[in-house]
């Protein structure tokens, strides 16, 4: 379907002229940022952004690619090099260290320099690196972590934890030898390393002792508490903070976020990761957009500003399963959260960054017709005279043989939310990819986000923009609307 207006060169000239006019009007804000928001699309490579843009457009009954995402409207863009010190293709732990702490680390470690070694507890001490969120807290700002994964997962843990093994969620996951050497599980670090004002996501089971039933799944032992030390970390967290509240469902979250007496809020909405957006029970679990809104309500009360980490963490999980439908619908909800945050904040005083920690071996090709379903088939047949989908994976669980050959695929199959796109190499889990990812920026000092940069640059831009360590002598004018 070719839109008639797009046949006319005037259409494209006019659109480009408008974009050029907007570009010419861009004025780098020379003030500091009062607030910092980093939106992290876990596994959201550029092919994911493009495919999600088309899907979001098509959900609005448009052809697809012409409708910008919320993140597309950010005026400044850079590329980020995502490699770990020891790996070309990274994981979410060491990348979190890069974009949150400003220092690259080794694969599967969090909050530690590359002098620390994966799984070697005795290499932890002395190699800790401090996140921008921690520095923001020390500067008097309120801080928050919002994610669709467990709050103890690799990406959010980068804001507060230091661990040689990203899988040490609760003490039950930490080998006895490491516990004896003093290495703490991530859940313990969540409540003890620093004072976090808002914590929203999944991960209930790591906070309670083994045998504690889950409120949502009380008859499923596997969803209950996992801790061996007998501790109730939520209770410990509440006891240390006046005005603190714990919630475990959407209704309680909405009530708490509107209560002026609540100064600290922990909301854990699933035992592990939160459900995919397409499976979410909207009466019980909040969406990423709703969690983001609740966090902003609480954090924006602080006249000194805030730091907020918002993660669309299950984009990555959809890709690992080779289920593009899941990855892309997660990306759309992530973009909805970005859009809502934009409505609740001002670009005059808030630096907002959107990026990914890494990409995935996810491709989009095959010359599909404009307006055709992003989950559909390429117009031609493959050399084996069978259909193939426009979305594919380089490797993963989508590699299946039927009678020794690649199975044919129909439009109705490929459009199913459960469908796994085919891959060239059989793996239990599809892998991350090593190419650069995009960084989108808006707000004070956003113009610094340019060119091709190390992933560590992101943390330094945030620290500089808010005049945090090591850039306290930033020489920037105070944020818009402040007097001190």
């Amino acid at each position: 379907i070719i839109p008639v207006e797009e046949e006319n060169p005037d259409f494209w000239n006019r659109e480009a002229a408008e974009a050029l006019g907007a570009a010419k009007k861009l004025q780098p804000a020379q003030t500091a940022a009062k607030n910092l928001i980093i939106f992290l699309g876990d596994g959201m490579g550029v092919s994911t952004v493009t495919a999600a843009r088309i899907l979001k457009g098509q959900k609005k009954d448009k052809l697809g690619p012409e409708i910008p995402l919320a993140m597309d409207r950010f005026p400044y863009v850079a590329l980020s090099k995502t490699y770990n010190v020891d790996k070309h293709v990274p994981d979410s732990g060491a990348t979190a260290t890069a974009y949150l702490c400003g220092v690259k680390g080794n694969f599967q470690t969090i909050g530690l320099s590359a002098a620390a070694r994966f799984n070697q507890c005795n290499t932890t001490r002395g190699n800790e690196v401090i996140s921008v969120m921690n520095r923001a807290k020390k500067a008097g700002k309120s801080v928050g972590v919002v994610t669709t994964t467990r709050v103890q997962h690799a990406s959010p843990a980068g804001t507060y934890a230091h661990t040689v093994n990203r899988n040490w969620y609760s003490d039950a996951d930490v080998p006895a030898s490491a516990r004896q050497e003093g290495c703490q599980d991530i859940a313990t670090q969540l409540i003890s390393n620093m004072d976090i004002d808002v914590i929203l996501g999944g991960g209930r089971k790591y906070m309670f002792r083994m045998g504690t039933p889950d409120p949502e799944y009380p008859d499923d032992y596997s969803q209950g508490g996992t801790r061996l030390d007998g501790k109730n970390l939520v209770q410990e967290w509440l006891a240390k903070r006046q005005g603190a509240r714990y919630v475990w469902n959407r209704t309680e979250l909405m009530q708490a976020s509107l209560d002026p007496s609540v100064t600290h809020l922990m909301g854990l909405f699933e035992p592990g990761d939160m459900k995919y957006e397409i499976h979410r029970d909207s009466t019980l679990d909040p969406s990423l957009m709703e969690m983001t809104e609740a966090a902003l309500r609480l954090l924006s009360r602080n006249p000194r500003g805030f730091f907020l980490f918002v993660e669309g963490g299950r984009i990555d999980h959809g890709h690992h399963e080779s289920r593009a439908y899941r990855a892309l619908t997660e990306t759309i909800m992530f973009d909805d959260a970005i859009e809502r945050a934009g409505q609740l904040t001002s670009e005059e005083d808030t630096l907002s960054l959107v990026t990914a920690d890494h990409s995935h071996v996810f491709s989009f090709g095959g010359y599909p017709l404009r307006g055709s379903s992003i989950f559909g088939l390429a117009p031609g047949k493959a050399r084996d005279r069978k259909a193939y989908t426009v979305l594919l994976y380089g490797n993963g669980p989508g590699y299946v043989l039927k009678d020794g050959a690649r199975p044919d695929v129909t439009e109705s199959e490929s459009g199913s939310p459960e469908y796994r796109q085919q891959s060239a190499v059989p793996l239990d889990e599809e892998t991350h990819a090593g190419e650069d990812v995009a960084v989108f920026a808006r707000g004070p000092q956003a113009h610094l986000v340019h060119g091709v940069q190390e992933q560590t640059f992101i943390a330094h831009v945030m620290a500089f923009a808010a005049c945090l360590e090591p850039y306290t002598a930033c020489d920037l004018a105070p944020p818009a609307g402040t007097t001190d």
Epitope: R209, G211, T212, P213, D214
Partner: nanobody
């Protein structure tokens, strides 16, 4: 407030059997897990077996096939039938009633005083 009263502990020979029971009284929230934990001298308290109010049962690997947990929801009582007892089963056995955290105000985790089980010839 919830009270838990255990009974049934004692001295038994290896290979023998014992039945522990635990009665809960007070203001008991309907969704809960009742179970048994044990603590041997100088060791930490370990889970033995638990039973949810909905009927799900879970055992520690070390007691599977030898111990059987059962509960009577109407009487708020949980039982532990222990067969083929071994010397390494010697410990203080504690009854526990726990409600999902965040479902009720106040305490959610209650423990009995413990009953001693000694397996020795």
């Amino acid at each position: 407030q919830v009270q838990l009263v255990e009974s049934g502990g004692g001295l038994v020979q290896p290979g023998g059997s014992l039945r522990l029971s635990c009665a809960a009284s007070g203001s008991i929230f309907s969704v809960n897990t009742m179970g048994w934990y044990r603590q041997a001298p100088g060791k930490q308290r370990d889970l033995v077996a638990v039973a949810t109010s909905g009927g799900t049962i879970h055992y520690a690997d070390s007691v599977k096939g030898r111990f059987t947990i059962s509960r009577d929801n109407a009487k708020n009582t949980v039982y532990l039938q222990m067969n083929s007892l071994k010397p390494e089963d010697t410990a203080v056995y504690y009854c526990n009633l726990v409600v999902p955290y965040g479902m009720i105000a106040g305490d959610h985790d209650y423990w009995g005083q413990g009953t001693k089980v000694t397996v020795s010839s």
